[in-house]
Interface confidence: low
């Protein structure tokens, strides 16, 4: 399916406003440090471009490529050298090794400072002073802090912040209709990064036999009606799509997501009854609402897995014939039976298997060295479920917060050389889980649970690899994505950390800590609990308990106080000597 | 709610002096953190310094070293001392305060680096 020009095929399929907030999204996400004037501009010269190329394909530029379009509208940029430094010497590189070279100078930890948002009146003259600014002043802003950020969903969640704004802006009560609004979106904006991130990591360091695995198993347990090869040829389609958003071809990843939505409402009967209310639905809610969708019920007659993938004398050679079609109808049998148990087990049980099969196959007698795989199974699937059993009975026990600080502080225990900051995000993270998974029926706990710890143990490998600091963690990271979890679990107490020299200047507050809203002060507390166990990382947890109980009674009795500020310098020295002595 | 006023801004030539005030009226009782920002002729607001009622300061690597933010309370005024000025620190200065972020903004002050 050639075309004359990329750049007009791409126009005429996604429209102009889609076209532009793609690229915008494309460009924001590339330059994270540029201002959103700049972008804007740079993103209506393409715009004016493409137009004249849908006019007439065979003008002046339109059959190149949109990497060297866009890769030659991004090198344009005049502060490119003092902005991004090394990044400049991407535009001396030819494609396609320019925009490998822009891709691998994407920052997932950008220098940005945290979105502040104004007033609710500040926020609302702004949306209708100019609507389309304010748009795409938030495609921008959350582009460049999330520069992985699934680009169709993107547009998704800017026409929910659009639709937010202009029904709360006409309320009584502008505030109590818009706030709880924006922080569902916020939530679920941040929820959809750390995901997308997942599944670019999968393509881009385990490659695209490791996101087909995970696909098959999750789409498996989604369809559990449809046939393998419908699986298939949606897991292919899939794949392209997330290779093309994870590459940076956004145009191309959005037209194909909406081909694989339409082809998916086409085809319903043999997919799932569950994707009708979906398909009702506009195209950027329909394939939001796809990706989404619930678990379909499973077919009620299905037979026992052992006949063909354990008892049958064909195994072996079913296997040798086709490897990777035999393992993933091996995955897609199991995953559709097993809507219970988390995508990262199915595919560790996928690999048990096929080691089982390659050790095996190669023996005097196969079936005999086979018969017992399964039971190799129940220690793989007992693991997790025994994870989630004893951590959300600590959740119950504890509540979020003081699950958090346990986090906090097993996890520094295992890895104290990882920054506090990091620390401090991805333990509140793996926190959450509680709240999100541990409410849930029992069939429902171990997919939550493990499949959102691997989203925020991914966030942690990320920012790991940007600065590495830890053997153990680059091991975990980077030997097994499905094993990722349990390679975290398994870490002890790091025998070999020469504990971090007490620093004054780490435990002194001020009286800004009393005008903090709760989370911050939250924040604050769990950074001064890192520090302790990076300082005595043997603590005991009632040696630590001590120390956080006496800094919240400190900082309690200080933000009462008339004069703060002098309370804090009065009584700071002394919290600190208290809890070097409770430490001692 | 808190007003602002910047004063201290002129032409000066590179490798000059300039000191920047910012005097704040109002519900000041509420102000933790005090900034300055700047905005270069066409480009986007820039972050320039910050300090903390408490006294602490953090400054992006543009101006480190060069610029110093202070500020006296008995006064309930903000001061940002800038040195060894470059043409490209030209822009509007503005003064930022509030009680978490910075959500009071003064109308801003002129500095022009130019031989």
């Known amino acids: 399916d050639t075309h004359k020009s990329e750049v007009a095929h791409r126009f005429k399929d996604l429209g102009e406003e889609h076209f532009k907030g793609l690229v915008l999204v494309a460009f924001s996400q590339y330059l994270q440090q540029c201002p959103f004037e700049e972008h804007v501009k740079l993103v209506n010269e393409v715009t004016e471009f493409a137009k004249t190329c849908v006019a007439d394909e065979s003008a002046e530029n339109c059959d190149k490529s949109l990497h060297t379009l866009f890769g030659d509208k991004l090198c344009t940029v005049a502060t490119l050298r003092e902005t991004y430094g090394e990044m400049a010497d991407c535009c001396a590189k030819q494609e396609p090794e320019r925009n490998e070279c822009f891709l691998q100078h994407k920052d997932d930890n950008p220098n940005l400072p945290p979105l502040v948002r104004p007033e609710v009146d500040v926020m609302c003259t702004a949306f209708h002073d100019n609507e389309a600014t304010f748009l795409k002043k938030y495609l921008y802003e959350v582009a460049r802090r999330h520069p992985y950020f699934y680009a169709p969903e993107l547009l998704f969640f800017a026409a929910r912040y659009k639709a937010a704004f202009a029904e709360c802006c006409q309320a009584a009560d502008k505030a109590a209709c818009l706030l709880p609004k924006l922080d569902e979106l916020r939530d679920e904006g941040k929820a959809s990064s750390a995901k997308q991130r997942l599944k670019c990591a999968s393509l881009q360091k385990f490659g695209d036999r490791a996101f087909k695995a995970w696909a098959v198993a999750r789409l498996s347990q989604k369809f559990p009606k449809a046939e393998f090869a419908e699986v298939s040829k949606l897991v292919t389609d899939l794949t392209k799509v997330h290779t093309e958003c994870c590459h940076g071809d956004l145009l191309e990843c959005a037209d194909d997501r909406a081909d694989l939505a339409k082809y998916m409402c086409e085809n319903q009967d043999s997919i799932s009854s569950k994707l009708k209310e979906c398909c009702d639905k506009p195209l950027l809610e329909k394939s939001h609402c796809l990706a989404e969708v619930e678990n379909d019920e499973m077919p009620a007659d299905l037979p026992s897995l052992a006949a063909d993938y354990v008892e049958s004398k064909d195994v072996c050679k079913n296997y040798a014939e086709a490897k990777d079609v035999f393992l993933g109808m091996f995955l897609y049998e199991y995953a559709r039976r097993h809507p219970d148990y988390s995508v990262m087990l199915l595919l560790r049980l996928a690999k048990a298997y096929e080691a089982t099969l390659e050790k095996c196959c190669a023996a005097a007698d196969p079936h005999e060295c086979y018969a017992k795989v399964f039971d190799e199974f129940q220690p793989l699937v007992e693991e997790p479920q025994n994870l989630v059993k004893q951590n959300c009975e600590l959740f119950e026990q504890l509540g979020e917060y003081k699950f958090q600080n346990a986090l906090l502080v097993r996890y520094t225990k295992k890895v104290p050389q990882v920054s506090t900051p990091t620390l401090v995000e991805v333990s509140r993270n793996l926190g959450k889980v509680g709240a999100k998974c541990c409410k849930l029926p029992e069939a429902k706990r171990m997919p939550c649970a493990e499949d959102y710890l691997s989203v925020v143990l991914n966030r942690l490998c990320v920012l790991h690899e940007k600065t590495p600091v830890s053997e153990k963690v680059t091991k975990c990271c980077t030997e097994s994505l499905v094993n990722r979890r349990p390679c975290f679990s398994a870490l002890e107490l790091d025998e070999a950390y020469v504990p971090k020299a007490f620093n004054a200047e780490t435990f002194t507050f001020h009286a800004d800590m009393c005008t903090l809203s709760e989370k911050e002060k939250q924040v604050k507390k769990q950074t001064a609990l890192v520090e302790l166990v990076k300082h005595k990382p043997k603590a005991t947890k009632e040696q630590l308990k001590g120390v956080m109980d006496n800094f919240a009674a400190f900082v309690e009795k200080c933000c009462k106080a008339d004069d703060k500020e002098a309370c804090f310098a009065e009584e700071g020295p002394k919290f600190v000597a208290a809890s070097q002595a409770a430490l001692a | 709610e808190v007003q602002l006023v910047e004063s201290g801004g002129g032409l000066v030539q590179p490798g000059g002096s300039l000191r920047l005030s910012c005097a704040a009226s109002?519900?000041?009782?509420?102000?933790?953190?005090m900034a300055w920002y700047r905005q270069a002729p066409g480009k986007g607001l820039e972050f320039v310094s910050r300090?903390?009622?408490?006294?602490?300061?953090n400054y992006p690597d543009s101006v480190k070293g060069r610029f110093t933010i202070s500020r006296d309370n008995s006064k309930n005024t903000l001061y940002l001392q800038m040195n060894s000025l470059r043409a490209e620190d030209t822009a509007v200065y503005y003064c930022?305060?509030?009680?978490?972020?910075?959500?009071?903004w003064g109308q801003g002050t002129l500095v022009t680096v130019s031989s």
């Open positions: 109002g519900s000041i009782e509420s102000i933790n953190r």
């Open positions: 300090i903390s009622k408490g006294g602490s300061t």
């Open positions: 930022a305060a509030g009680p978490v972020w910075e959500q009071f």
